[in-house]
Amino acid sequence: YGSGSKLKVPELSLKGTQHVMQAGQTLFLKCRGEAAHSWSLPTTVSQEDKRLSITPPSACGRDNRQFCSTLTLDTAQANHTGLYTCRYLPTSTSKKKKAESSIYIFVSDAGSPFIEMHTDIPKLVHMTEGRQLIIPCRVTSPNVTVTLKKFPFDTLTPDGQRITWDSRRGFIIANATYKEIGLLNCEATVNGHLYQTNYLTHRQTNTILDVQIRPPSPVRLLHGQTLVLNCTATTELNTRVQMSWNYPGKATKRASIRQRIDRSHSHNNVFHSVLKINNVESRDKGLYTCRVKSGSSFQSFNTSVHVYEKGFISVKHRKQPVQETTAGRRSYRLSMKVKAFPSPEIVWLKDGSPATLKSARYLVHGYSLIIKDVTTEDAGDYTILLGIKQSRLFKNLTATLIVNVKPQIYEKSVSSLPSPPLYPLGSRQVLTCTVYGIPRPTITWLWHPCHHNHSKERYDFCTENEESFILDPSSNLGNRIESISQRMTVIEGTNKTVSTLVVADSQTPGIYSCRAFNKIGTVERNIKFYVTDVPNGFHVSLEKMPAEGEDLKLSCVVNKFLYRDITWILLRTVNNRTMHHSISKQKMATTQDYSITLNLVIKNVSLEDSGTYACRARNIYTGEDILRKTEVLVRDSEAPHLLQNLSDYEVSISGSTTLDCQARGVPAPQITWFKNNHKIQQEPGIILGPGNSTLFIERVTEEDEGVYRCRATNQKGAVESAAYLTVQGTSDKSNLE
C-alpha cells in the first residue's frame, strides 16, 4: 500500500478484476480509501457467517488521513464465489457517491464446479421471447468447461454472438426464442466426474387482457355488512401478474386479501384477488382500485363503495303516470325510477293481482315490468310493490297503461274473392265496413271515379291512385247515395263500428273506399264498384238455330271492367281431346258503357258448321280464361210441303175471310200469294200474316173473287196450292175470265 496521491476510488489489496483461490483457504481483502467505506458481498455470503470478519474503516496511511478496512473469510467455500465490492459511504458533501472498486473471487472446488446445484428440482428461469435469457450456471473456477444441453438430446453451442459463455454469469442467450423453452442443463466434467445443474425455462409474457371487479360499481352496503370485491385479471397463457389494492382503509389494513389462479381456461390465465372487509363502517366508503402489473404492463380497475347507515326506498314514475303503447309491439317496458338499499323485494300487480301469475308474457326485470307481444288485454293499472322486510320499509306506485290499436277493417281480413263482384245496373247496393281500433277510429267514405273511354276497350281504366273525393249523403259524385250511417256493435266481445254506405242507383263504375284512422294509423279498404248491364257479367246468345244455307248469328257480351281479350272459338273433340279452333273473319268487338260485345256471323252455313261455339274472355284480375259455350246444330235442308191444301171457299160480300197456307221445310220456306196469277202485295184491306202464311181479306168486294194460289219456296224446291174464292151477292159472271 503506497500513500501517494488522493484516491478517487477505493483501492483493493488484490489487483485485477478477478482472483482464483482454492476452497478451504482464507480470503484476505483490504480496502483503502479517502473516506469511510462499506463492503458489498455475493448473495451467497451471509453477513452473519462466523467465518466472515470485516474490520470497520479506521484511520491509516500517512498522517492517518486515509481509511482502511479488512475483509477476512476463513475456510472459503465454493458458494462464496462472487463479486466483492468496496464503496465509499455516501455523505451529503461527498461527490464520490458511486465511487467503488470490485473484484470477482473464484473459490475453486473440484467437488463443486457449479456455485448453485439444482439436481433435485430444476430452477425455474423466466424468459421473454426476443429478450436476453441467462442460464445462471455460474462456476467456481474460470477454467471449468461447461456444456449447455436441452432435454432430451440437443446441445446449445455458444457461437460468440447469440449464445455466449461467461463463467461469472452463466450462458447468455442474446435474444431468446421459443426454442430455448424446456428443461436445460449445464454439464461439467471435473476429474472424470460429471456434474449437472438443471434449469426449466418458462415463457414469460406481460399481456394483461382484461381487469374487472365484481360486483360491478357502485357497490352498496349497510353498516355492519361484509364487503367482498373480486378483482379478476385475464392474461395470456404464461403471463404472471402482481395484484394489489388501493382503498380507503389501506393504511390501517382494514381488508384481508386472498389471491388465486384459475388455469381452467384453454386460452388464457385468470388471476383472482379477493378483498374482504367484515363489518363495514362509514369510513370504508370510497374508491377501491385493483392494480395489476406484469413486467412493464399495468392496468387498474376502480369501483366505488357506498356504506349506508339504514335502508331506504324512493320510487317515482320514470314516464307519465298514464302511459300508452300499441298492440302488436314485440315488447313494452313499464319502468319506475327506484332508489333503494338494500335491494327490495319487487312484486308487480296488474289490476290488483300479481302480474306474472296472470300471463307468462309478463317478465320482471329490475324495477321494470316487460310485457311481451302487447295485446289489448294488457291495458290496465300496474302497481309496483317494493319492500325491504328487515328495515320494515314498503312503498308502492301505480301507473295506468293504455293499449292503442291501429284501426282494422274486418272485411279486409276475410279472404276476398279473386275478382271483384259486379253490381247490376240500376240496383240498390249496401256497402259495409266493420272497424275496430283504440282510440275509436273515425270512418270516412271516399269515391275514386274511373275515367274510362267508351270508344275503345280499356281494361286498366280504373286505378286506385286516381284522385279521390270524400263522400257525404248529399254528394252527387258517382252514384246517388241513399245514406251513410254508423252503428256500434259488439262482435266477439269487442266494440266495433259498422259503417254502411247505401248506393241508391248503381250507374257509375269506380272505387268506393272506407278509410278508418286514429292516432296510431290509417287503414283503407277499397271496394271496386263495377256496374254491369250483362247478367253475371258474361252472356252468350244465338239468334236462331240455322238451317243449311242460312246465316249463323252469335253474340257475346262481357262486362268490360272484368274481362278483356274477347274472342270466339270452335271446340272440336278429336280422340277424346278437346281442341280449340280459332275462328277467322271475326268482327271487331264494340265497347259500350259497361260491356264489350263481339258478334259472330257465319254466312250460308253447312252441316259441317255444327258444333260447340264458345266465347272466351280473360278475367283481368285472375288472368283466367273463361268460356261460355253454346251448341249449334245446323239443320238439314228439306223441300217445302204444305200441311193442308187450299180449298174453294165462298164468302159473303162485305164479310171477311182468311186463307191459310201452312208450309214446312228446311230452311223455313218463303211463302208468296198470287190472285189470278198476280203476286199479292199487302195493301189496305189485304193483310199478310206472320211469315206470309195467312192472307186476310176484310170487307170482301166482288173484285176479290178469283183463283188464289200460295207458293212455298226454299233452296230445295217449291210447292203450291190453289182455290177459288166465290163472293156471294154479286151479279152472275163467269168464274173464269
Epitope: 436441452k150 432430451p152 440437443d154 421459443y178 424446456g182 415463457r203 397463457l237 381456461h265 386460452h267
Partner: antibody, heavy 116, light 111 residues
Amino acid sequence: EVQLLESGGGLVQPGGSLRLSCEASGFIFRDYNMNWVRQAPGKGLEWVSIITNDGSSTAYSDSVKGRFTISRDNSKNSLYLQMNSLRAEDTAIYYCVKVYYGMDDWGQGTTVTVSS
Amino acid sequence: QSVLTQPPSASGTPGQRVTISCSGGSSNIGSNYVSWYQQLPGTAPKLLIYFNFQRPSGVPDRFSGSKSGTSASLAISGLQSEDEADYYCAAWDDRVNVWVFGGGTKLTVLG
C-alpha cells in the same frame, strides 16, 4: 384448459399406412416437446416417439424406427404420426402427449387396428 | 420386457399406506428425473409425480415420490377406493435417447 384431440385411427391391413393427427389447444403449442405413446390392448404404456418444440430433433423407439415418422406444424397447433408398413403388433390406442415437467397432458387416444 | 421394473400388482385396504417400486439403471433413473402416471380404468393416463417427487396442482398430498440411485418409489398413504388404478413410472434414457416406462402396477383396494 389443455386439450389434445387425436384423430386418424382406424382399421388397416398389415403393410398398410395411416396418418394420426393431434390438434392442441389451451397452451402455446410451439413451446413444448411432444410425444406419441401407445398402449396395446390389455398391456402397459409404450413410448413411441418424441419431437422437440421447434421440430428440429426427433427420436423413436426401436420397435417403430424406420417405419414411423413424427412431425408437427406449429402454425396449426398440430402433431402428426405417419405410420407405414404397419404390423399386427402396432395395434393399440395411440396417445398424443405434451412434455414439460414430465408427460404433463394426455389426449383421449385414437385406436389403430392392424388386421387382415 | 420393460426397461424399468415394477411389481405387476399391489394391494391394500382403505386407509393403509402402499408403496410401489420402480427399478432402472444409471442411464435412466440414475441420471434423469422420474415421473409417475395413474391410469384409471378406461381413461387416459394422468401425470401424478414429476421431477422425482413434485406433485402437479390438483394431485392430493397422499401421493408422494422419491428417488435413490437407480430406483424410485411411489407411496400412497390413506388409501382410498378411487385410487384403484394402474400406476406407471417413466424416465428418459440418455444412453439410447428414448423414454422408458415400467411395466405398470395394478393397485387393488381391498374390502
